[in-house]
Protein backbone atom coordinates (compact mmCIF):
# COMPACT_ATOMS: atom_id res chain seq x y z
CA UNK A 1 0.00 0.00 0.00
CA UNK A 2 1.18 3.51 -0.89
CA UNK A 3 0.70 5.78 2.12
CA UNK A 4 1.33 9.02 0.17
CA UNK A 5 -2.31 10.14 0.19
CA UNK A 6 -3.06 9.58 3.87
CA UNK A 7 -4.25 12.44 6.06
CA UNK A 8 -1.06 12.64 8.12
CA UNK A 9 -2.34 15.25 10.58
CA UNK A 10 -5.38 13.12 11.46
CA UNK A 11 -3.18 10.04 11.92
CA UNK A 12 -0.84 12.07 14.11
CA UNK A 13 -3.80 13.21 16.22
CA UNK A 14 -4.98 9.61 16.61
CA UNK A 15 -1.51 8.53 17.64
CA UNK A 16 -1.11 11.26 20.24
CA UNK A 17 -4.59 10.86 21.71
CA UNK A 18 -4.52 7.10 22.25
CA UNK A 19 -1.98 4.94 20.42
CA UNK A 20 1.04 6.54 22.11
CA UNK A 21 -0.42 5.85 25.54
CA UNK A 22 -1.09 2.20 24.64
CA UNK A 23 2.53 1.82 23.51
CA UNK A 24 3.75 3.29 26.80
CA UNK A 25 1.52 0.87 28.72
CA UNK A 26 2.89 -2.04 26.72
CA UNK A 27 6.46 -0.93 27.48
CA UNK A 28 5.87 -0.22 31.18
CA UNK A 29 8.53 -1.75 33.37
CA UNK A 30 11.11 -1.68 30.58
CA UNK A 31 14.29 0.36 31.12
CA UNK A 32 14.58 3.30 28.76
CA UNK A 33 18.21 2.34 28.08
CA UNK A 34 17.36 -1.20 27.06
CA UNK A 35 16.82 -1.00 23.29
CA UNK A 36 18.57 0.97 20.56
CA UNK A 37 16.41 1.84 17.57
CA UNK A 38 17.72 0.21 14.40
CA UNK A 39 14.74 0.84 12.11
CA UNK A 40 14.42 4.36 10.72
CA UNK A 41 12.27 6.25 8.23
CA UNK A 42 12.90 9.29 6.09
CA UNK A 43 9.45 10.79 5.47
CA UNK A 44 5.86 10.27 6.55
CA UNK A 45 4.75 7.71 3.92
CA UNK A 46 7.96 5.75 4.55
CA UNK A 47 7.35 5.90 8.33
CA UNK A 48 3.82 4.52 7.91
CA UNK A 49 5.16 1.71 5.69
CA UNK A 50 7.63 0.72 8.40
CA UNK A 51 5.03 1.13 11.16
CA UNK A 52 2.60 -1.11 9.30
CA UNK A 53 5.27 -3.76 8.74
CA UNK A 54 6.43 -3.83 12.37
CA UNK A 55 2.92 -3.71 13.78
CA UNK A 56 1.18 -6.31 11.64
CA UNK A 57 3.80 -8.64 10.20
CA UNK A 58 4.80 -11.48 12.54
CA UNK A 59 8.55 -11.70 13.07
CA UNK A 60 10.82 -14.33 14.57
CA UNK A 61 10.32 -14.18 18.31
CA UNK A 62 7.28 -11.88 18.15
CA UNK A 63 4.17 -13.15 16.42
CA UNK A 64 1.48 -11.48 18.51
CA UNK A 65 1.57 -7.67 18.18
CA UNK A 66 -1.37 -7.42 15.75
CA UNK A 67 -3.83 -8.28 18.51
CA UNK A 68 -2.58 -5.63 20.92
CA UNK A 69 -4.74 -2.58 21.61
CA UNK A 70 -2.23 -0.18 19.99
CA UNK A 71 -2.21 -2.33 16.85
CA UNK A 72 -5.98 -2.38 16.55
CA UNK A 73 -6.11 1.40 16.99
CA UNK A 74 -3.32 1.82 14.43
CA UNK A 75 -5.26 -0.32 11.96
CA UNK A 76 -8.41 1.72 12.57
CA UNK A 77 -6.56 5.04 12.05
CA UNK A 78 -5.00 3.83 8.79
CA UNK A 79 -8.36 2.48 7.58
CA UNK A 80 -10.07 5.80 8.28
CA UNK A 81 -7.38 8.24 7.10
CA UNK A 82 -5.66 6.36 4.25
CA UNK A 83 -7.90 6.06 1.16
CA UNK A 84 -8.30 2.44 0.07
CA UNK A 85 -6.17 1.06 2.90
CA UNK A 86 -8.82 -1.24 4.39
CA UNK A 87 -9.43 -2.95 1.04
CA UNK A 88 -5.76 -3.86 0.73
CA UNK A 89 -5.83 -5.43 4.20
CA UNK A 90 -8.72 -7.90 3.75
CA UNK A 91 -6.57 -10.77 2.48
CA UNK A 92 -3.87 -10.06 5.05
CA UNK A 93 -6.45 -10.14 7.86
CA UNK A 94 -7.88 -13.45 6.69
CA UNK A 95 -4.42 -14.97 6.57
CA UNK A 96 -3.69 -13.67 10.05
CA UNK A 97 -6.87 -15.21 11.48
CA UNK A 98 -5.64 -18.62 10.39
CA UNK A 99 -2.36 -18.28 12.25
CA UNK A 100 -3.60 -16.44 15.35
CA UNK A 101 -1.71 -17.37 18.49
CA UNK A 102 -2.13 -16.51 22.15
CA UNK A 103 -0.61 -13.18 23.21
CA UNK A 104 2.84 -13.51 24.74
CA UNK A 105 4.99 -10.49 25.65
CA UNK A 106 8.51 -11.55 24.79
CA UNK A 107 11.68 -9.50 24.99
CA UNK A 108 11.67 -9.49 21.18
CA UNK A 109 8.18 -7.95 21.20
CA UNK A 110 9.31 -5.27 23.66
CA UNK A 111 12.22 -4.47 21.38
CA UNK A 112 9.86 -4.28 18.40
CA UNK A 113 7.50 -1.91 20.22
CA UNK A 114 10.48 0.26 21.18
CA UNK A 115 11.28 0.44 17.45
CA UNK A 116 7.65 1.38 16.79
CA UNK A 117 7.84 4.26 19.26
CA UNK A 118 10.89 5.56 17.41
CA UNK A 119 9.15 5.29 14.03
CA UNK A 120 6.12 7.16 15.36
CA UNK A 121 8.41 9.89 16.74
CA UNK A 122 9.88 10.37 13.27
CA UNK A 123 6.41 10.28 11.71
CA UNK A 124 5.33 13.06 14.08
CA UNK A 125 8.47 15.09 13.53
CA UNK A 126 10.27 14.34 10.25
CA UNK A 127 13.64 16.05 10.02
CA UNK A 128 13.33 16.81 6.34
CA UNK A 129 12.36 20.41 5.55
CA UNK A 130 9.77 19.49 2.92
CA UNK A 131 7.79 17.61 5.56
Amino acid sequence: YDFTNCDFEKIKAAYLSTISKDLITYMSGTKSTEFNNTVSCSNRPHCLTEIQSLTFNPTAGCASLAKEMFAMKTKAALAIWCPGYSETQINATQAMKKRRKRKVTTNKCLEQVSQLQGLWRRFNRPLLKQQ
Partner: antibody, heavy 119, light 107 residues
Protein backbone atom coordinates in the same frame (compact mmCIF):
# COMPACT_ATOMS: atom_id res chain seq x y z
CA UNK B 1 16.82 9.11 35.46
CA UNK B 2 17.25 11.09 32.23
CA UNK B 3 19.88 13.82 32.51
CA UNK B 4 21.52 16.28 30.12
CA UNK B 5 24.68 17.82 31.55
CA UNK B 6 26.28 20.69 29.67
CA UNK B 7 29.84 22.02 29.67
CA UNK B 8 30.84 25.09 31.67
CA UNK B 9 30.68 28.79 30.90
CA UNK B 10 32.88 30.21 28.14
CA UNK B 11 34.29 33.67 27.43
CA UNK B 12 35.25 34.18 23.78
CA UNK B 13 36.67 36.88 21.54
CA UNK B 14 34.69 38.16 18.53
CA UNK B 15 35.51 36.13 15.42
CA UNK B 16 36.45 32.99 17.37
CA UNK B 17 34.47 29.74 17.83
CA UNK B 18 32.92 27.96 20.77
CA UNK B 19 31.99 24.31 21.21
CA UNK B 20 29.39 23.42 23.84
CA UNK B 21 28.88 19.81 24.92
CA UNK B 22 25.78 18.06 26.22
CA UNK B 23 26.29 14.66 27.87
CA UNK B 24 23.17 12.50 28.01
CA UNK B 25 22.48 9.69 30.45
CA UNK B 26 19.54 7.57 31.62
CA UNK B 27 18.17 6.68 28.17
CA UNK B 28 19.19 5.25 24.81
CA UNK B 29 21.01 8.28 23.34
CA UNK B 30 20.60 7.23 19.69
CA UNK B 31 16.81 7.00 19.92
CA UNK B 32 15.91 10.64 20.57
CA UNK B 33 16.62 13.90 18.78
CA UNK B 34 18.72 16.53 20.55
CA UNK B 35 17.66 20.15 20.07
CA UNK B 36 19.70 23.29 20.65
CA UNK B 37 18.10 26.53 21.83
CA UNK B 38 19.63 29.80 22.97
CA UNK B 39 18.49 32.68 25.14
CA UNK B 40 20.15 36.09 25.00
CA UNK B 41 20.21 38.09 28.27
CA UNK B 42 16.67 39.15 29.19
CA UNK B 43 15.34 37.76 25.91
CA UNK B 44 13.21 34.85 24.74
CA UNK B 45 14.08 31.43 23.33
CA UNK B 46 15.57 30.95 19.87
CA UNK B 47 15.85 27.54 18.20
CA UNK B 48 19.26 26.84 16.66
CA UNK B 49 18.83 23.37 15.23
CA UNK B 50 18.35 19.67 15.82
CA UNK B 51 20.39 16.50 15.37
CA UNK B 52 19.42 12.85 15.20
CA UNK B 53 22.26 11.14 17.09
CA UNK B 54 21.31 7.82 15.52
CA UNK B 55 22.31 8.80 12.00
CA UNK B 56 23.74 12.33 12.25
CA UNK B 57 20.88 13.98 10.32
CA UNK B 58 20.54 17.66 11.14
CA UNK B 59 18.26 20.60 10.48
CA UNK B 60 19.31 24.19 11.17
CA UNK B 61 17.61 27.49 11.64
CA UNK B 62 18.60 29.55 8.57
CA UNK B 63 19.77 32.31 10.94
CA UNK B 64 22.61 30.01 12.04
CA UNK B 65 23.34 28.15 8.80
CA UNK B 66 27.00 28.07 8.02
CA UNK B 67 27.92 29.20 11.55
CA UNK B 68 26.41 26.45 13.71
CA UNK B 69 27.50 22.83 13.46
CA UNK B 70 25.74 20.08 15.38
CA UNK B 71 27.42 16.73 15.96
CA UNK B 72 26.90 13.71 18.20
CA UNK B 73 29.22 11.04 19.54
CA UNK B 74 27.29 7.84 20.21
CA UNK B 75 30.22 6.22 22.02
CA UNK B 76 30.08 8.84 24.77
CA UNK B 77 26.38 9.79 24.46
CA UNK B 78 27.42 13.41 23.94
CA UNK B 79 26.00 16.03 21.59
CA UNK B 80 27.96 19.11 20.54
CA UNK B 81 27.06 22.53 19.22
CA UNK B 82 29.85 24.57 17.65
CA UNK B 83 29.25 28.21 16.74
CA UNK B 84 31.85 30.04 14.66
CA UNK B 85 32.51 33.66 13.70
CA UNK B 86 31.23 34.79 17.07
CA UNK B 87 29.94 38.31 17.58
CA UNK B 88 28.69 40.15 20.66
CA UNK B 89 25.07 39.33 19.78
CA UNK B 90 25.90 35.64 20.32
CA UNK B 91 26.27 36.29 24.05
CA UNK B 92 23.59 34.00 25.47
CA UNK B 93 22.77 30.91 27.48
CA UNK B 94 22.83 27.87 25.18
CA UNK B 95 20.59 24.91 26.03
CA UNK B 96 20.43 21.37 24.73
CA UNK B 97 17.12 19.54 25.07
CA UNK B 98 15.79 16.09 24.26
CA UNK B 99 12.64 15.42 22.27
CA UNK B 100 9.89 13.70 24.26
CA UNK B 101 8.56 10.18 23.71
CA UNK B 102 6.04 11.38 21.11
CA UNK B 103 8.43 13.58 19.12
CA UNK B 104 6.29 16.68 19.69
CA UNK B 105 8.05 18.55 22.51
CA UNK B 106 11.28 18.92 24.50
CA UNK B 107 10.92 17.05 27.78
CA UNK B 108 14.42 17.23 29.30
CA UNK B 109 16.72 20.27 29.17
CA UNK B 110 20.35 20.77 30.05
CA UNK B 111 21.23 23.31 32.75
CA UNK B 112 22.46 25.75 30.11
CA UNK B 113 25.91 27.02 29.14
CA UNK B 114 26.64 30.73 29.31
CA UNK B 115 28.72 31.97 26.37
CA UNK B 116 30.00 35.53 26.62
CA UNK B 117 31.49 37.17 23.53
CA UNK B 118 33.57 40.19 24.41
CA UNK B 119 36.74 41.87 23.18
CA UNK C 1 9.41 31.54 9.45
CA UNK C 2 6.20 31.20 11.43
CA UNK C 3 5.87 34.02 13.93
CA UNK C 4 4.26 33.18 17.28
CA UNK C 5 2.82 36.25 19.01
CA UNK C 6 1.96 36.02 22.70
CA UNK C 7 -0.33 38.36 24.65
CA UNK C 8 -0.10 39.75 27.21
CA UNK C 9 3.64 40.04 27.72
CA UNK C 10 3.16 40.29 31.47
CA UNK C 11 0.52 39.24 33.95
CA UNK C 12 0.05 40.00 37.63
CA UNK C 13 -2.40 37.62 39.28
CA UNK C 14 -3.69 37.12 42.80
CA UNK C 15 -3.19 33.57 44.14
CA UNK C 16 -6.29 31.45 43.56
CA UNK C 17 -7.37 33.55 40.59
CA UNK C 18 -7.28 32.37 36.95
CA UNK C 19 -4.79 33.44 34.29
CA UNK C 20 -4.93 33.21 30.51
CA UNK C 21 -2.31 33.63 27.80
CA UNK C 22 -2.99 33.91 24.07
CA UNK C 23 -0.62 32.72 21.34
CA UNK C 24 -1.30 33.53 17.69
CA UNK C 25 0.60 31.95 14.79
CA UNK C 26 1.26 33.88 11.58
CA UNK C 27 0.02 30.85 9.62
CA UNK C 28 -1.68 27.59 10.51
CA UNK C 29 0.35 25.26 12.69
CA UNK C 30 -2.42 22.66 12.97
CA UNK C 31 -2.24 21.40 16.57
CA UNK C 32 1.55 21.50 16.80
CA UNK C 33 1.83 23.84 19.77
CA UNK C 34 3.72 23.27 23.03
CA UNK C 35 3.80 25.35 26.22
CA UNK C 36 6.82 25.71 28.50
CA UNK C 37 7.44 27.48 31.79
CA UNK C 38 10.82 28.95 32.63
CA UNK C 39 11.09 29.63 36.33
CA UNK C 40 13.59 32.29 37.47
CA UNK C 41 17.18 31.06 37.09
CA UNK C 42 16.10 27.69 35.65
CA UNK C 43 15.91 25.91 32.30
CA UNK C 44 12.51 25.79 30.59
CA UNK C 45 10.22 22.92 31.58
CA UNK C 46 7.55 21.21 29.52
CA UNK C 47 3.93 21.72 30.55
CA UNK C 48 1.60 21.01 27.62
CA UNK C 49 2.29 19.30 24.28
CA UNK C 50 0.22 19.01 21.11
CA UNK C 51 -2.09 21.85 22.21
CA UNK C 52 -3.78 20.19 25.19
CA UNK C 53 -1.87 17.12 26.42
CA UNK C 54 -0.42 17.36 29.93
CA UNK C 55 3.17 16.28 30.34
CA UNK C 56 3.80 13.77 33.12
CA UNK C 57 3.32 15.30 36.57
CA UNK C 58 1.89 18.61 35.35
CA UNK C 59 -1.13 19.65 37.48
CA UNK C 60 -4.48 19.73 35.72
CA UNK C 61 -5.03 23.36 36.71
CA UNK C 62 -2.88 24.03 33.62
CA UNK C 63 -4.67 23.59 30.31
CA UNK C 64 -4.22 24.36 26.63
CA UNK C 65 -6.65 24.74 23.75
CA UNK C 66 -6.93 25.96 20.17
CA UNK C 67 -6.05 24.92 16.63
CA UNK C 68 -4.86 26.46 13.40
CA UNK C 69 -3.58 29.91 14.34
CA UNK C 70 -5.19 30.73 17.71
CA UNK C 71 -4.12 29.06 20.94
CA UNK C 72 -4.81 29.66 24.61
CA UNK C 73 -3.03 28.57 27.77
CA UNK C 74 -4.92 28.78 31.06
CA UNK C 75 -4.21 28.37 34.75
CA UNK C 76 -7.47 27.80 36.60
CA UNK C 77 -6.09 28.83 40.01
CA UNK C 78 -2.69 30.51 40.14
CA UNK C 79 -0.29 29.43 42.88
CA UNK C 80 2.88 31.14 44.11
CA UNK C 81 5.06 28.47 42.48
CA UNK C 82 3.67 29.34 39.02
CA UNK C 83 5.78 32.48 38.68
CA UNK C 84 8.07 32.64 35.67
CA UNK C 85 7.93 33.14 31.92
CA UNK C 86 5.55 31.06 29.82
CA UNK C 87 6.43 30.32 26.20
CA UNK C 88 4.39 28.85 23.37
CA UNK C 89 6.28 27.04 20.62
CA UNK C 90 5.29 25.68 17.22
CA UNK C 91 6.89 22.56 15.76
CA UNK C 92 4.77 22.40 12.61
CA UNK C 93 7.41 23.83 10.29
CA UNK C 94 11.14 24.41 10.40
CA UNK C 95 12.53 26.54 11.84
CA UNK C 96 10.82 25.85 15.15
CA UNK C 97 9.78 29.15 16.72
CA UNK C 98 8.78 30.39 20.16
CA UNK C 99 6.53 33.20 21.31
CA UNK C 100 8.20 36.17 23.02
CA UNK C 101 7.16 34.87 26.43
CA UNK C 102 4.65 36.01 29.04
CA UNK C 103 5.94 36.89 32.49
CA UNK C 104 3.61 35.83 35.30
CA UNK C 105 3.95 37.58 38.63
CA UNK C 106 2.01 37.11 41.86
CA UNK C 107 0.15 40.12 43.29
Amino acid sequence: EVQLVQSGAEVKKPGSSVKVSCKASGYAFSNYLIEWVRQAPGQGLEWIGVIDPGNGDTNYNENFKGRATLTADKSTSTAYMELSSLRSEDTAVYYCAREDNTGTAFDYWGQGTTVTVSS
Amino acid sequence: SIVMTQTPLSLSVTPGQPASISCKASQSVSSDVTWYLQKPGQSPQLLIYYVSNHYTGVPDRFSGSGSGTDFTFKISRVEAEDVGVYYCQQHHRFPLTFGQGTKLEIK
